[in-house]
């Protein structure tokens, strides 16, 4: 298997996932497409952690571009006899992948906390509150309680959808970076490609 090609595949995937993370996080600032709640600071505290913009987004672009840069047309050297620089690059990509793991891990943790706590909303008493914070995430299973939030409109659906998307995207990014750690270690130790005859796209 060509480790460089696999790294490039992972890199391209991470770029797409990072952009989706950034988009999902930005949407969290505009419940129901409205700007007033951000300006009034009536958003969940976990929205302000920038988990999708920084953790699953910008921080993910660094390893993504490192991985993309690894694969070249002349990628095949064998078992350490040639392309020592590329083997070093593969090993250094492990460091980039670890940065990616940290970013995606941060995204996953914050998204999970945001889901568990629920949104900040105007509750049935007319108070801006974390209405579902005490339910330990059980509100996710009982949609009949979601009407306890009177404002913003559909805020529970909005928060649950977008934090779930961030959780899923961050999880995929985490797995891809983990794969690249393994890929990078194998590529660095075994050689950039194992033979001229066998090349596989991942």
């Amino acid at each position: 298997m060509c480790y460089g090609k696999c790294a490039r595949c992972i890199g391209h995937s991470l770029v797409g996932l990072a952009l989706l993370c950034i988009a999902a996080n930005i949407l969290l600032y505009f419940p129901n497409g409205e700007t007033k709640y951000a300006s009034e600071n009536h958003l969940s505290r976990f929205v302000w952690f920038f988990s999708g913009i920084v953790g699953g987004g910008l921080l993910m672009l660094l390893p993504a571009f490192v991985f993309i840069g690894l694969e070249q047309d002349d990628c095949c050297g064998c078992c350490g006899h040639e392309n020592c620089g590329k083997r070093c690059a593969m090993l250094s990509s492990v460091l980039a992948a670890l940065i990616g793991i940290a970013g995606s891990g941060y995204c996953v943790i914050v998204a999970a906390l945001g889901l568990a706590e629920g949104p900040l909303c105007l509750d049935s008493l007319g108070q801006w509150n974390y209405t579902f914070a005490s339910t330990e995430g059980q509100y996710l299973l009982d949609t009949s309680t979601w009407s306890e939030c009177t404002e913003p409109k559909h805020i529970v659906e909005w928060n649950v959808s977008l934090f779930s998307i961030l959780l899923a995207l961050g999880g995929i990014e985490f797995i891809l970076c983990l794969i690249q750690v393994i890929n990078g270690v194998l590529g660095g130790i075994c050689g950039f490609c194992c033979s001229h005859q066998q090349q596989y796209d991942c």
């Epitope: 108070q127 801006w128 009177t150």
Partner: antibody, heavy 120, light 106 residues
């Protein structure tokens, strides 16, 4: 001047429905909720529920759930309260009240009240 | 449901006297509001958040208390103060009112 003006008195038969209107003026309608409170003759005050005028989401008191519907028309700054399946003990003065959101939540502006009499 | 019990049910006093109205909850609450109602009129907000004077309300009205016991005090009764007074809690749904205290002229 901030005020809430309610529709006139109504006389209804048991089993019928009544719809009371409440027109707001002198303030931004969607910045405050509207609560509905009723008072039976010679009795105390009873909270029926409230509506978020910005989103249109209502919250009903358990005793009235399934029998009451609260709506708003933001174009005319008017709130409505419809009570169905009327009984004789629904005879009361119905008030709409401006509701201030926040840590201190209070009813600072009251309508003049609408007397609903349920009698066969 | 939080039940508010007001006492006394009726308070007979003369103008110029001090009136002390009590409101007791069956469980602890954060704040209460006080309203005044005169015959044939809608209630009027007097005190919000236990101790804050509503706009346009004279300084002779004051509120205090915490937990389960709350008090409305009228330092010196004026003729226009003879009315029914209600306390109201907003700590949990349903929002509830006390049964009222009627302040009448002695």
């Amino acid at each position: 001047e901030v005020q809430l003006v309610q529709s006139g008195a109504e006389v209804k038969k048991p089993g019928a429905s009544v719809k009371v209107s409440c027109k707001a003026s002198g303030y931004t309608f969607t910045n405050y909720g509207v609560k509905w409170v009723r008072q039976a003759p010679g009795q105390g005050l009873e909270w029926m529920g409230w509506i978020n005028t910005y989103t249109g989401n209502p919250i009903y008191a358990a005793d009235f759930k399934g029998r009451v519907t609260m709506t708003t028309d933001t174009s005319t700054s008017t709130a409505y309260m419809e009570l169905r399946s009327l009984r004789s003990d629904d005879t009361a003065v119905y008030y709409c009240v401006r509701f201030q959101y926040g840590d201190y939540r209070y009813f600072d502006v009251w309508g003049q009240g609408t007397l609903v009499t349920v009698s066969s | 449901e939080i039940v508010l019990t007001q006492s006394p049910a009726t308070l007979s006093l003369s103008p110029g006297e001090r009136a002390t109205l009590s409101c007791r909850a069956n469980s602890g609450i954060s704040f209460i509001n006080w309203y005044q109602q005169k015959p044939g009129q809608a209630p009027r907000l007097l005190i919000y958040g236990t101790a804050n004077l509503a706009s346009g309300i004279p300084a002779r009205f004051s509120g205090s208390g915490s937990g389960r016991d709350f008090t409305l005090t009228i330092s010196s009764l004026e003729p226009e103060d003879f009315a029914v007074y209600y306390c109201q809690q907003y700590s949990s749904n349903p929002l509830t009112f006390g049964g009222g205290t009627k302040v009448e002229i002695k």
